[in-house]
């Protein structure tokens, strides 16, 4: 008799990443009988929610339901109906909501409450919405990339199934850049983690990991730009800010009230004699770099060594995966290739920033002007953060791998978050089964 395929025995999970600038929904899938195997969970869908991050809905919470509808309906379509009720849904909010909570716990709670009520209306197993800590964001990003790279597997492969495979079990460090915060997470080499807040201990698949992590709130690319503008407008003589981080010929009016809306600019807040100012781009990488460096306080360090702002950072060790905005920005600038040296990246940034705005708009006609205008700043910021902030050098630059996806799954904290909450990363190495489960009879 002919073998007949059984219904696919799979499970699904949904994680919403409620970031500072936008929300993305990820759908994950894995074989039900291989839950404890490493590397079996993969992403089947990403849906980017149209609109800003959830923290921007503070004055219009009634619109949150509509905002989430399209992507939640997409999840309904992708996941078989029979699986809906057992598919967990998690929403994790990151630095945008951390900042809102700093301003008002009540407002942050109100937003999360409406989000929870909206998500509860769907036929899935809603597991809650919460603001994750910066430490969690760093840790789950580290778990995600190492899980996808097969670093937790004890089986050494003679063939490479993933890019960046170094054919050893040394874990990759994780560099995550968002709109409002940035995280650095890695296993230091035989180094005491001098600051307890930055130390994490994991036992995964029978192996112990002592992990360093830190999340720099206000140092995501969007908040770093607000900080820089707030700092620089204090040195401007008038309502014209000649800004080296924007292309020559670029002009944009900024409301002072918007500038001081975020807690990230509080340290620079002063009474200005105007309500608005105009950014006028002058497109000079070197001056932009210098201005950015002023956001990093490197004059104070209570430890053997620091990143900036007095935060402990052990010596860098091994390879690093740089993802989220690190990847998106460098991908746009065509600088993600392993062959591009740090000197070459700097050279390319100098040329890019110096290009006139009119020329840039013509060259990238399909890109939204708001995003297009900020790539000079963002690229320069990434270089400044990695080189002066985290102390990468021209030599260690080659250990940074700009990663968008690994094996079809986005690099980011969401997969690690779900793996943890669904208990799919065992502390001990699972016993290997002599026979694999057949899906045919």
């Amino acid at each position: 008799t002919q073998n007949k395929a059984l219904p696919e025995n799979v499970k699904y999970g949904i994680v919403l990443d409620a970031g500072s600038s936008h929300t993305s929904l990820y759908i994950y899938k894995w074989p039900a009988e291989k839950e404890n195997d490493t590397g079996v969970v993969h992403q089947v869908e990403e849906c980017r929610v149209k609109g800003p991050g959830i923290s921007k809905f503070v004055q219009k919470v009634n619109e949150i339901g509509i905002y989430l509808t399209d992507c939640m309906e997409r999840a309904r379509e992708v996941i078989p109906r029979s699986q809906h009720q057992e598919t967990p849904v998690y929403l994790g909010a990151t630095a945008g909501m951390r900042l809102l909570r700093m301003e008002s716990e009540e407002l942050a709670d109100r937003v999360l409450d409406v989000v929870e009520r909206s998500l509860s209306n769907y036929p899935f197993d809603f597991q809650g919405a919460r603001i994750i800590t910066g430490q969690e964001e760093g840790a789950y990003g580290w778990i995600t990339i190492n899980y996808l790279l097969g670093k937790f597997s004890q089986k050494t492969r003679w063939f490479s199934i993933v890019p960046y495979e170094t054919n050893n079990q040394e874990t990759f460090g994780a560099l995550d850049l968002g709109g409002a915060s940035t995280q650095v997470t890695f296993v230091p080499q035989n180094q005491t983690i001098e600051s307890p807040d930055n130390a994490l201990q994991f036992r995964l698949y029978g192996k112990d990991y002592n992990v360093y992590t830190h999340s720099f709130l206000c140092y995501g690319k969007d908040q770093a730009l607000w900080q820089k503008l707030a700092k620089d407008i204090q040195v401007a003589s008038n309502e014209i800010l000649r800004d080296p981080c924007f292309h020559p010929g670029y002009k944009k009016v900024v409301n002072v009230s918007d500038l001081y809306k975020t807690p990230c600019t509080k340290r620079f807040e002063m009474t200005l004699p105007f309500q608005q100012f105009e950014i006028q781009g002058i497109g000079n990488y070197q001056q932009c770099h210098q201005s950015i460096l002023e956001l990093f306080n490197t004059s104070y360090c209570p430890y053997s060594q620091c990143a900036f702002n007095g935060i402990f950072l052990p010596p860098l060790q091994g390879d690093f995966g740089a993802f989220s905005a690190f990847y998106f920005v460098m991908k746009f600038l065509n600088l993600t290739s392993e062959k591009v040296s740090q000197e070459k990246v700097t050279e390319m940034m100098k040329k890019f920033c110096a290009q006139p705005w009119e020329e840039i708009k013509t060259s990238y006609a399909g890109v939204k002007e708001k995003y297009l205008s900020e790539y000079c700043f963002s690229g320069t910021y990434i270089l400044s953060l990695l080189l002066q902030g985290y102390h990468f050098t021209a030599d260690s630059w080659e250990h940074i791998h700009f990663i968008g996806k690994i094996q079809g799954s986005d690099a980011g904290w969401t997969l690690g978050y779900m793996l943890n909450l669904t208990n799919m990363i065992p502390a001990e190495q699972p016993l290997s089964t002599p026979l694999s489960h057949s899906t045919y009879v």
Epitope: A236, N238, M270
Partner: antibody
């Protein structure tokens, strides 16, 4: 040619008042300028008194100058510095300056001497 | 108000020598610093703005730099015409810090 010129200096009695005028020529006092006053006692260093932001009329003063010194814009080409309760310590050359923080906007007048003496 | 501490008060160097003047700000002023040159009977002349930018028409022998809250003016290849008093001025955050000057440094060229 852009120029600033101070006037109104001279001898004044202790506890007396005086108003100095700063006249701009070759340019108008447009909204994008800070117009400032700085003084220098004989043989001493420069001392910032205050500024007016032309665009909004907002004034800023050194903490020691608040109350006794008032900066105003009186026309499209002039700003004034009103001084009250003058003492011998206020004897100085008073400079008017256009403070635009780059290489093109910074402009100073030659100064006017104020002597407070009985 | 912010306090700008300028050192030394006076310095004497021969023609062709180098002079270094330092200015310490009591608060972080984020490169918001200007350097002026003043000769007797004249108003100050802007040399450097935003800590390290050379004003137009100023000789490249004048160099401004910054390290944290300490700012430095270096004059190299001294000429007789460089004999003057030099002042630093805060240019950051007028509403909070004002526009304080340093005490001045008299440069004598031998």
């Amino acid at each position: 040619q852009e120029q600033l010129e101070e006037s109104g200096g001279g001898l004044v009695q202790p506890e007396g008042s005086l108003t100095l005028t700063c006249k701009a020529s070759g340019f108008a006092l447009s909204s994008s300028y800070y117009m400032c006053w700085v003084r220098q006692a004989p043989g001493k260093g420069l001392e910032w008194i205050g500024c007016i932001y032309i665009g909004s009329g907002t004034t800023y003063y050194a903490s020691w100058a608040k109350g006794r010194f008032t900066i105003s814009k009186t026309s499209s080409t002039a700003v004034t510095l009103q001084m009250t309760g003058l003492t011998a310590a206020d004897t100085a050359t008073y400079f008017c300056a256009r403070d635009q923080y780059d290489d093109s906007g910074n402009l100073w007048g030659p100064g006017t001497l104020v002597t407070v003496s009985s | 108000d912010i306090v700008m501490t300028q050192t030394p008060a006076s310095v004497s160097e021969p023609v062709g020598g180098t002079v270094t003047i330092k200015c310490q700000a009591s608060q972080n002023i984020y490169s918001g610093l200007a350097w002026y040159q003043q000769k007797p009977g004249q108003p100050p002349k802007l040399l450097i703005y935003k800590a390290s930018n050379l004003a137009s028409g100023v000789s490249s022998r004048f160099k401004g730099s910054r390290s944290g809250t300490e700012y430095t003016l270096t004059i190299s290849d001294l000429e007789c015409a460089d004999a003057a008093t030099y002042y630093c001025q805060n240019w950051y955050g007028i509403s909070t810090y004002g526009r304080a000057f340093g005490g001045g440094t008299e440069v004598v060229v031998k």
